[in-house]
C-alpha cells in the first residue's frame, strides 16, 4: 500500500541495506525509491540531541513483510519508498540547501556569480552530481564565490556537514535541464576500453544502455552479447567512465556493442522500464516466490504487483499439466539485475513494470499509427486537446497538447481577444467535435501563460501554456507527449504528423473528426527562401511538401507537430502560421519547441 507521509520522531528498526547521506528526509525518500531494494528508510535530521556525525544519514531498509517495527527517536524521520505508489515519480531536486556542505570528490573549482550559476555549471558538466557554493559572505576571502563541482560513486554525498555561508544543491540533469549532448549512437562490434565502474548482467544492449543511463557514475557502456566467445562474459554489461567524459579508446571486437548514457535526454526515453520479453532465456537471482501463471504476460503482472519482485522467469506448462498453467518464478537481486542469464532452457524472462512510473509518462507506447486516410481514430493522438471558448458562443478555438498532468502547450496567438481564462474549456480524449455536449466533462483553465516576448505569430515566440484547474488522469485516450530533448538538437525527425480539427482548405469550416497529415520537415534555409518577407528564426521550424497539398490550416493553430523518434513521440512544433494553406512552396511554420524547453520547464516546474 502507498504511504507518502513522513513519520516524525520515528525510527524503523532493522532491515538495513545501506546508509547514504541526504540533505533532507524528502530526498532520502527519493533515494530509497530509486534504490533497487529499498522499501523503507530512516533519516536523521540535525538536532542538538543527536551526534552530529549521524546528522543527515539516510538508512535504506528492506523487509520481507514490507514493514518494520517502529521505535520512537527524536530527530529521526522515517517513511516508505514510492515504489508502492502508482503516481509518477521524479528524481528532479531543485532545492538549494543553505549552510550545508555536501561532501564528495571536488574535481572542479571555479568562480561563479551566484548559486544558480553554480548549479547550471553542475547541470552542464558530465561528471557533476552536486555542488557547494561559498557565498560572498563566506568568512575566507579566497573562497568567496567559489563553485565546487562534486561527484561520488553513488551520486549522493559521502557526508554532509553544517557550514555557515555556503549553499549546496544537486545537478538538474534529472529535471531535463542539461545542455549536454544526448549521444544516441550505438557502435556494433566495439569495445570501449576505459575504466569499469560497475558491471551487471543484461539481456541486450538496450537494457544495458538504460542501466547505464540511471547509474550515477556511468557515462558509456560496453555490452557482450550472448554470442561473445568468452562464456563467462556473455550478457555482461560493463558500466564505464573516463576523465574526458568520452571513451578514450575504442577497440573492434565481434559480438560486443557499445554506447552512451542517455542521462541528458532521459526525460524523453524509457530508462527504468524494460518492457520486452526475452524468449528462451532464464534470469537467475534470489527466488521470492513461485506461482502458477497462464502466460508470460500474466507472470509479468504478478511480478509487477509484488513490490519486491524485480524480474521473473516463466516456464511454460508441459502439455495438459496444471490446467495449462506454467511456473512463474518471481526473483530479485541486490542491484535489480539478474545474477546470471542463461539461454536455451525454454524459459521466458522479463522485468517488473513497477519502475515504469519512474519514467516520464510520455514515453509509454501508444497504439500503432493507422496508415493511410486523413481521419484519425480514437487514441491515436492522445495528447491532442481541443480548446474551446464559451464567448460569445461555445466553439473550437485552437488545438493544444498535454505535456503534463496540469499543463497544455499551445500557441500564444490563440488568445488574441481572450480577456480571461474563465471562458476557456479544454477537452481531452476527443475524436469528434460532435461528442462535446453540455454535460461533457472538461478542464477549466486556471492560468494562461503567454511568452513575454510574443507580439505576433510571424515574429516568433508564439507559445503559451495553460495551467488547468484540475489534473488530468492519464488513460489510453489522454496522455502527455514528450518534449524534445535539448541534447537532441542534431536529431533529424523523419516521421512527423500535424493534427487538428482545422479547415481542410482556406475557405472551409472546422472539421468534426480529428484530421492527420504526415508532413516532412523543411530546413530553415529552404523555408527562408519561401518566405522572403519574413525572418525565419532558429526558434521556428517548417514543414510541408514542395508541391503543397498537405498542411495545417485555420483552427489547427496551437496543435502539435508530433514526430516519432526511437519509438517515442516528441512535440517538435506548435502550429503557428503560414501563407495560405497547403500552397505550393509555402511550408507551414511552427514554433520550434526544443528552443523553448527551458521556458516551459521554468514555468511548469515553478514552486
Amino acid at each position: 500500500e502507498c504511504v507518502t507521509q513522513l513519520l516524525k520522531d520515528t525510527c524503523f528498526e532493522g532491515g538495513d541495506i545501506t546508509t547514504v547521506f541526504t540533505p533532507s528526509a524528502k530526498y532520502c525518500q527519493v533515494v530509497c525509491t530509486y534504490h533497487p531494494r529499498c522499501l523503507l528508510f530512516t533519516f536523521t535530521a540535525e538536532s542538538p540531541s543527536e551526534d552530529p556525525t549521524r546528522w543527515f544519514t539516510c538508512v535504506l531498509k528492506d523487509s520481507v513483510t514490507e514493514t518494520l517495527p517502529r521505535v520512537n527517536r527524536t530527530a529521526a524521520i522515517s517513511g516508505y519508498s514510492f515504489k508502492q505508489c502508482s503516481h509518477q515519480i521524479s528524481a528532479c531536486n531543485k532545492d538549494i540547501y543553505v549552510d550545508l556542505d555536501m561532501k564528495g570528490i571536488n574535481y572542479n573549482s571555479s568562480v561563479a556569480k551566484s548559486a544558480q550559476e553554480c548549479q547550471e555549471r553542475c547541470t552542464d558538466d558530465v561528471h557533476c552530481h552536486f555542488f557547494t557554493y561559498a557565498t560572498r559572505q563566506f568568512p575566507s576571502l579566497e573562497h568567496r564565490n567559489i563553485c565546487l563541482l562534486k561527484h561520488t560513486q553513488t551520486g549522493t554525498p559521502t557526508r554532509i556537514t553544517k557550514l555557515d555561508k555556503v549553499v549546496s544543491g544537486f545537478s538538474l540533469k534529472s529535471c531535463a535541464l542539461s545542455n549536454l549532448a544526448c549521444i544516441r549512437d550505438i557502435f556494433p562490434n566495439t569495445v570501449f576500453a576505459d575504466s569499469n565502474i560497475d558491471s551487471v548482467m543484461a539481456p541486450d544492449a538496450f537494457v544495458c544502455g538504460r542501466i547505464c543511463t540511471h547509474h550515477p557514475g556511468c557515462l558509456f557502456f560496453t555490452f557482450f552479447s550472448q554470442e561473445w566467445p568468452k562464456e563467462s562474459q556473455r550478457n555482461l554489461c560493463l558500466l564505464k567512465t573516463s576523465e574526458s567524459g568520452l571513451p578514450s579508446t575504442r577497440i573492434k571486437k565481434s559480438k560486443a556493442l557499445s554506447g552512451f548514457s542517455l542521462q541528458s535526454c532521459r526525460h524523453s526515453i524509457p530508462v527504468f522500464c524494460h518492457s520486452s520479453f526475452y524468449h528462451d532465456t532464464d534470469f537467475l537471482g534470489e527466488e521470492l516466490d513461485i506461482v502458477a501463471a497462464k502466460s508470460h504476460e500474466a507472470c509479468q503482472k504478478l511480478c509487477t504487483n509484488a513490490v519486491r519482485c524485480q524480474f521473473f522467469t516463466y516456464t511454460p506448462a508441459q502439455a495438459s499439466c496444471n490446467e495449462g498453467k506454467g511456473k512463474c518464478y518471481l526473483k530479485l537481486s541486490s542491484n535489480g539485475s539478474p545474477t546470471k542469464i542463461l539461454h536455451g532452457r525454454g524459459g521466458i524472462s522479463g522485468y517488473t513494470l513497477r519502475l515504469c512510473k519512474m519514467d516520464n509518462e510520455c514515453t509509454t507506447k501508444i497504439k500503432p499509427r493507422i496508415v493511410g486516410g486523413t481521419a484519425s481514430v480514437r487514441g491515436e493522438w492522445p495528447w491532442q486537446v481541443t480548446l474551446h471558448t464559451t464567448s460569445p458562443t461555445q466553439r473550437h478555438l485552437c488545438g493544444g497538447s498535454i505535456i503534463g498532468n496540469q499543463w497544455i502547450l499551445t500557441a500564444a496567438h490563440c488568445f488574441y481577444g481572450v480577456e480571461s481564462p474563465k471562458i476557456l474549456r479544454v477537452y481531452s480524449g476527443i475524436l469528434n467535435q460532435s461528442e462535446i455536449k453540455e454535460d461533457t466533462s472538461f478542464f477549466g483553465v486556471q492560468e494562461i501563460i503567454i511568452h513575454d516576448q510574443y507580439k505576433m505569430a510571424e515574429s516568433g515566440y508564439d507559445i503559451a501554456l495553460l495551467k488547468l484547474e484540475t489534473t488530468v488522469n492519464y488513460t489510453d485516450s489522454q496522455r502527455p507527449i514528450c518534449l524534445p530533448s535539448k541534447g537532441d538538437r542534431n536529431v533529424i525527425y523523419t516521421d512527423c504528423w500535424v493534427t487538428g480539427w482545422g479547415y481542410r482548405k482556406l475557405r472551409d469550416k472546422i472539421q468534426n473528426t480529428l484530421q492527420k497529415a504526415k508532413i516532412p520537415l523543411v530546413t530553415n534555409e529552404e523555408c527562408q527562401k519561401r518566405y522572403r518577407g519574413h525572418k525565419i528564426t532558429h526558434k521556428m521550424i517548417c514543414a510541408g511538401y514542395r508541391e503543397g497539398g498537405k498542411d495545417a490550416c485555420k483552427g489547427d493553430s496551437g496543435g502539435p507537430l508530433s514526430c516519432k523518434h526511437n519509438e517515442v513521440w516528441h512535440l517538435v512544433g506548435i502550429t503557428s502560421w503560414g501563407e495560405g494553406c497547403a500552397q505550393r512552396e509555402r511550408p507551414g511554420v511552427y514554433t520550434n519547441v526544443v528552443e523553448y524547453v527551458d521556458w516551459i520547464l521554468e514555468k511548469t516546474q515553478a514552486v
Partner: antibody, heavy 125, light 108 residues
C-alpha cells in the same frame, strides 16, 4: 548518388584559423559517422578526426588535439572542421570521408567508402 | 598506437603481371583492415574492407587476405588503370585510425 564536397581551404598564416566544410548529398547523412583525413604534398594519408552520427562522440589525432574541432549539422547535411593555431605542418589536402556502415545488422565495417575531392590548406607566412 | 608497415614502398610492374603488397600491424588487429587505391591528383577509393571483402563495383582482380598482424593485397592481372598508390588502413583500435605508408605501383 553519394557526393561529398569540401570547401573552405586556402592560404593562411601560421597561428591563423580556417573552417572547412563538407556538404553531403545522396544518402541519409544523420545515419553515418564521418571522418577528416589529410595528405601532405607528396606524402601518405593521415587520419585527422572522426565524429559519430549524432555528433556527440568525437575523436582526434594527437597532432591536432586541442587545435581542431570537428562538428556536424545534420539538418544541413554538413560536416565541419574548425582549425585554429595552424602550423606549417598542417599544410595538406583535406578530405572528408564517410564510414561504410552505421547500422546494427551483421556486417558492420568502418571502411571509408566515399571520399570528397579534397580542399587544399596551405599554412605559410 | 598501432603502426602499419606496408611493403614494398614502391614496385614496378607490367600490364598483366600479378602484384602482391603486404601490410603488417604492430599488434593483432583481427580482420579490421581496409585497402585503398589512390590515383594521382584524386581522392582515395575503397577496394577491400575487413581484410578480404571486395567493395561493390570493384573489379574481381583485386583481392585481400590475412588476419591478426599479417595481411596481403593482390592484383591478379595488372590493368593500365591500376598504376596508382595503394594504402592499407586499420580500424581495430581508435584513436588513431592509422594508414600504412603506401605502395606506389608504376610501369616497368
Amino acid at each position: 548518388e553519394v557526393q561529398l564536397l569540401e570547401s573552405g581551404g586556402g592560404l593562411v598564416q601560421p597561428g591563423g584559423s580556417l573552417r572547412l566544410s563538407c556538404a553531403a548529398s545522396g544518402f541519409t547523412f544523420s545515419h553515418y559517422s564521418m571522418q577528416w583525413v589529410r595528405q601532405a604534398p607528396g606524402k601518405g594519408l593521415e587520419w585527422v578526426s572522426s565524429i559519430s552520427p549524432s555528433g556527440g562522440y568525437t575523436m582526434y589525432a594527437d597532432s591536432v588535439k586541442g587545435r581542431f574541432t570537428i562538428s556536424r549539422d545534420n539538418s544541413k547535411n554538413t560536416l565541419y572542421l574548425q582549425m585554429n593555431s595552424l602550423r606549417a605542418e598542417d599544410t595538406a589536402m583535406y578530405y572528408c570521408a564517410r564510414e561504410k556502415a552505421s547500422d546494427l545488422s551483421g556486417t558492420y565495417s568502418e571502411a571509408l567508402d566515399y571520399w570528397g575531392q579534397g580542399t587544399l590548406v596551405t599554412v605559410s607566412s | 598506437d598501432i603502426q602499419m608497415t606496408q611493403s614494398p614502398s614502391s614496385l614496378s610492374a607490367s600490364v598483366g603481371d600479378r602484384v602482391t603488397i603486404t601490410c603488417q600491424a604492430s599488434q593483432d588487429i583481427d580482420y579490421y583492415l581496409n585497402w585503398y587505391q589512390q590515383q594521382p591528383g584524386k581522392a582515395p577509393q575503397l577496394l577491400i574492407y575487413d581484410a578480404s571483402n571486395l567493395e561493390t563495383g570493384v573489379p574481381s582482380r583485386f583481392s585481400g587476405s590475412g588476419s591478426g598482424t599479417d595481411f596481403t593485397f593482390t592484383i591478379s592481372s595488372l590493368h593500365p588503370e591500376d598504376f596508382a598508390t595503394y594504402y592499407c588502413q586499420q580500424y581495430h583500435t581508435l584513436p588513431p585510425l592509422t594508414f600504412g605508408g603506401g605502395t606506389k605501383v608504376d610501369i616497368k
